[in-house]
Amino acid sequence: HSDGIFTDSYSRYRKQMAVKKYLAAVLGKRYKQRVKNK
């Protein structure tokens, strides 16, 4: 377990947050488009 704790780094956390934000924006956009098309 030499590097066990260091996998939970702030830089990794920031990347995860950026991905989540991007996915939320894309999915939100698709949902709006679907509602609009109805």
């Epitope: 030499s2 066990g4 704790i5 260091f6 780094s9």
Partner: antibody
Framework: QSVEESGGRLVTPGTPLTLTCTVS????????MSWVRQAPGKGLEWIGI??????TYYASWAKARFTISKTSSTTVDLKMTSPTTEDTATYFC?????????WGPGTLVTVSS | DPVLTQTPSSVSAAVGGTVTINCQSS????????LSWYQQKPGQSPKFLIY???NLASGVPSRFKGSGSGTQFTLTISDLECDDGATYYC??????????FGGGTEVVVK
């Protein structure tokens, strides 16, 4: 994403006490959580950490006095085995492996007879 | 256990001025850069400022600057504002999965 500590209270010396850290917005399966304490008017003191796999590591002074355990996917406990008056402090839970980027507000433990 | 020594323990400077805080570690931090800085005001939990020696956390003004590597690190706060008055701590992560905090530096803004 946030963390919150609970369980702090007034205890007499030698009475075991368990503090709980509850996380929200993320899972402990991908996080390392530390316990840090701060005696009144003093600096921050690292107690120990539990990694995403449940492995625990402690400051050498804390090894025999504290036990950290994961009790669910959202809770981590800190057990004070036999508190002394020297353990009077605010106890913080913080996320991150050696860099502590999400902190709770802390819970106050007072050890007094 | 590793020991982190912060100097000075207290520093005073005028609004608009600059303060420098040093943090020396008794052993090299993980990857030579696993050193972070925190700001704490009375009655509050610490606020994460800088990670991996020199990177600013989200929302932290660029007036805060971290530098250093291995065992010697520095936090510089320029263009001081009244709100910067606080106690600052360094923290290190080390091989063997242990961590530690410096003793803290009180910054007084005049």
């Amino acid at each position: 994403q946030s963390v919150e500590e609970s369980g702090g209270r007034l205890v007499t010396p030698g009475t075991p006490l368990t503090l709980t850290c509850t996380v929200s917005g993320f899972s402990l399966s991908s996080a390392a959580m530390s316990w840090v304490r701060q005696a009144p008017g003093k600096g921050l003191e690292w107690i120990g950490i539990i990694d995403d796999s449940g492995n625990t590591y402690y400051a050498s002074w804390a090894k025999a006095r504290f036990t950290i355990s994961k009790t669910s996917s959202t809770t981590v406990d800190l057990k004070m085995t036999s508190p002394t008056t020297e353990d009077t402090a605010t106890y913080f839970c913080a996320r991150g492996g050696g860099e502590f980027f999400i902190w709770g507000p802390g819970t106050l433990v007072t050890v007094s007879s | 256990d590793p020991v982190l020594t912060q100097t000075p323990s207290s520093v005073s400077a005028a609004v608009g001025g600059t303060v420098t805080i040093n943090c020396q570690s008794s052993q090299s931090v993980y990857n030579n850069k696993w050193l972070s800085w925190y700001q704490q005001k009375p009655g509050q939990s610490p606020k994460f400022l800088i990670y991996q020696a020199s990177n600013l956390a989200s929302g932290v003004p660029s007036r805060f600057k971290g530098s250093g590597s291995g065992t010697q690190f520095t936090l510089t706060i320029s263009d001081l504002e009244c709100d910067d008055g606080a106690t600052y701590y360094c923290a290190g992560g080390y091989r063997g999965n242990v961590c530690g905090f410096g003793g803290g530096t009180e910054v007084v803004v005049k």
